[in-house]
């Protein structure tokens, strides 16, 4: 079907006073919500830095790329994007930096083509376990999401609920097994102290996982074994001290993997020997020549690849009677 070129929705920025007059009506094919910019030729609507407090009701049906960044949405209710007829083409939705602190169950329901979702830079104190799955069924309908960007969504300390932030995020990722098709997951800059052990096993399609700039101390209980499609694993700028044999073997067994480990406080003692041996042999670590020791003090800034077993000693543990106070 040929769209009429003469009356196609051109770039437009609607006058604010029109909003109330049309918001209750079904959207016209070529209208643009107040305070937004629209291009049907680019299938894009941008409502950026406009201090919007709710999602516009009169979004054009052609929208494939929707930018609602830099607003003051606060709460994303159930069916926030549900329209009649539905926004059947919406594929990429960017809500970053819009002061969202609550995303309710079913917020993204009725978006059958939604492939990319960015909620970054929102202080998400309350992310419903069913935000992405839409229902509390043990097995939900598969979500079409392929990329989920959740960088810097940790709220300030005083706004957090009395529960684990990591647990809240993981519950939303795993609910109803809806995100089995997810290929890219970004969770950078969220102050994560740990990664719940079951999260990766239930996201088998992952190609790209970004956990950079968190506070992860250990990967001991995290299994990468099922992530046979994983291509990139970003672990830069965490608090990792050492990677143990089990983790090293699992990473080495992934056929397409590239691992990024820069800027972690590696502890170069006897427990590091296996990792150093592995680093010298593996091709999976990008920039492995940049990895340096942080502790103990005598080893600070030593390059891991240049260490040998004689460098990696552990101070003997003194029996209690010989320990000094």
């Amino acid at each position: 079907s040929s769209s009429p070129t003469s009356s196609a929705s051109s770039f437009s920025s609607s006058a604010p006073f029109l909003a109330s007059a049309v918001s209750a009506q079904p959207p016209l094919p070529d209208q643009c919500p107040a305070l937004c910019e629209c291009s049907e030729a680019a299938r894009t609507v941008k409502c950026v830095n406009r201090n919007l407090t709710e999602v516009p009701t009169d979004l054009p049906a052609y929208v494939r790329n929707l930018f609602l960044t830099g607003n003051q949405l606060a709460v994303l209710p159930a069916g926030a994007f549900a329209r009649r007829p539905p926004l059947a083409e919406l594929a990429a939705l960017n809500l970053s930096g819009s002061r969202l602190d609550e995303v309710r169950a079913g917020a993204f329901e009725h978006l059958p083509s939604l492939r990319q979702l960015d909620l970054s830079h929102n202080p998400l104190a309350d992310l419903s376990p069913f935000a992405f799955s839409g229902s509390n069924a043990s097995v939900s309908a598969p979500s079409p999401l392929v990329e989920l960007i959740l960088n810097h969504i940790v709220p300030p300390e005083d706004e957090r609920q009395n529960r684990s932030f990591e647990g809240m995020v993981v519950a939303a990722l795993l609910a109803g097994r809806a995100l089995q098709g997810l290929r890219r997951l970004e969770l950078a800059s969220n102050h994560f102290l740990y990664l719940p052990r079951d999260v990766l096993a239930q996201l088998p399609s992952l190609r790209h996982l970004d956990l950079s700039n968190n506070s992860l101390v250990s990967l001991t209980y995290v299994s990468f074994r099922n992530l046979t499609h994983l291509e990139s694993l970003h672990l830069e700028d965490n608090a990792l001290k050492v990677l143990h044999n089990g983790t090293l073997a699992e990473l080495q067994g992934l056929p397409h993997i590239r691992v990024f480990l820069d800027n972690n406080p590696w502890v170069c003692d006897c427990h590091m020997a296996d990792m150093v041996t592995w680093l010298k042999e593996t091709e999976v670590v990008q920039g492995k020549d940049r990895l340096t020791c942080a502790y103990p003090e005598k080893m600070r800034n030593r390059v891991l690849l240049e260490l040998n077993s004689a460098d990696l000693d552990c101070d003997p543990i003194l029996p209690p009677s010989l320990q000094t106070s």
Epitope: S1, S2, S3, T5, A8, S10, F11, S13, E37, S39, E40, A41, A42, R43, T44, K46, R64, N65, A91, A92, R115, Q116, D118, E147, I149
Partner: antibody, heavy 122, light 107 residues
């Protein structure tokens, strides 16, 4: 990495129909908008039209009465037909893709075919 | 249709110099504008999309700016391989249109 390979007749007589096909390799066919663009010798670029995965088309008004763009999703191919050609249609014809669904979405054609030189001469 | 006017038509500079190319639209195109580079006998190559975002693999010396009707492509320090023809293109409205091009030549 998506690649486009195009082919079709390079020498036409006036009043004949230009017919070009572009095959898509290595990518999701449904994610893109498929365009045809032409460039007369020594001149700039002219957009002919585009089609999306659903078959929805948009054409340049200056060529609309003569142009048909179609898609064959089973073969991952899309085609251009331009009827009643004249010498003014002599140009290099490019197929190109714009991905409308990637997070780093492009407003430009980010993948191009190699170009087919079409000469219209009696 | 939206007319894009590029200036200058030809720009003569030496390697290492800074190049500034302009594109003006006959009506607002928001940020729905792309820049391409074309070398003789080759298809155009996308440099910048959405007015200011570098496409994958494009060197950092290329930058785009502008919104509405006035746009600029800047090449901070010209390399020998940068001498080519540059086109702007809008995707705000159908028909999609290109500027007439700016030829960047070696002085």
């Amino acid at each position: 990495q998506v690649q486009l390979q195009q082919w079709g007749a390079g020498l036409l007589k006036p009043s004949e129909t230009l017919s070009l096909t572009c095959a898509v390799y290595g990518g999701s066919f449904s994610g893109y908008y498929w365009s045809w663009i032409r460039q007369p010798p020594g001149k700039g670029l002219e957009w002919i039209g585009e089609i999306d995965h659903s078959g929805s088309t948009n054409y340049n008004p200056s060529l609309k009465s003569r142009v048909t763009i179609s898609v064959d999703t089973s073969k991952n191919q899309f085609s251009l037909k331009l009827s009643s050609v004249t010498a003014a249609d002599t140009a290099v014809y490019y197929c190109a893709a714009w991905f409308g669904e990637l997070w780093d979405y492009y407003y430009g054609m980010d993948v191009w075919g190699q170009g087919t030189t079409v000469t219209v001469s009696s | 249709e939206i007319v894009l006017t590029q200036s200058p038509a030809t720009l003569s500079l030496s390697p290492g110099e800074r190049a500034t190319l302009s594109c003006r639209a006959s009506q607002s195109v928001s940020s729905f504008l792309a820049w391409y580079q074309q070398k003789p006998g080759q298809a155009p190559r996308l440099l910048i999309y959405d007015a200011s975002n570098r496409a994958t693999g494009i060197p950092a010396r290329f930058s785009g700016s502008g919104s509405g009707t006035d746009f600029t492509l800047t090449i901070s320090s010209l390399e020998p391989e940068d001498f080519a023809v540059y086109y702007c293109q809008q995707r705000s409205n159908w028909p999609l249109t290109f500027g007439q091009g700016t030829r960047l030549e070696i002085k």
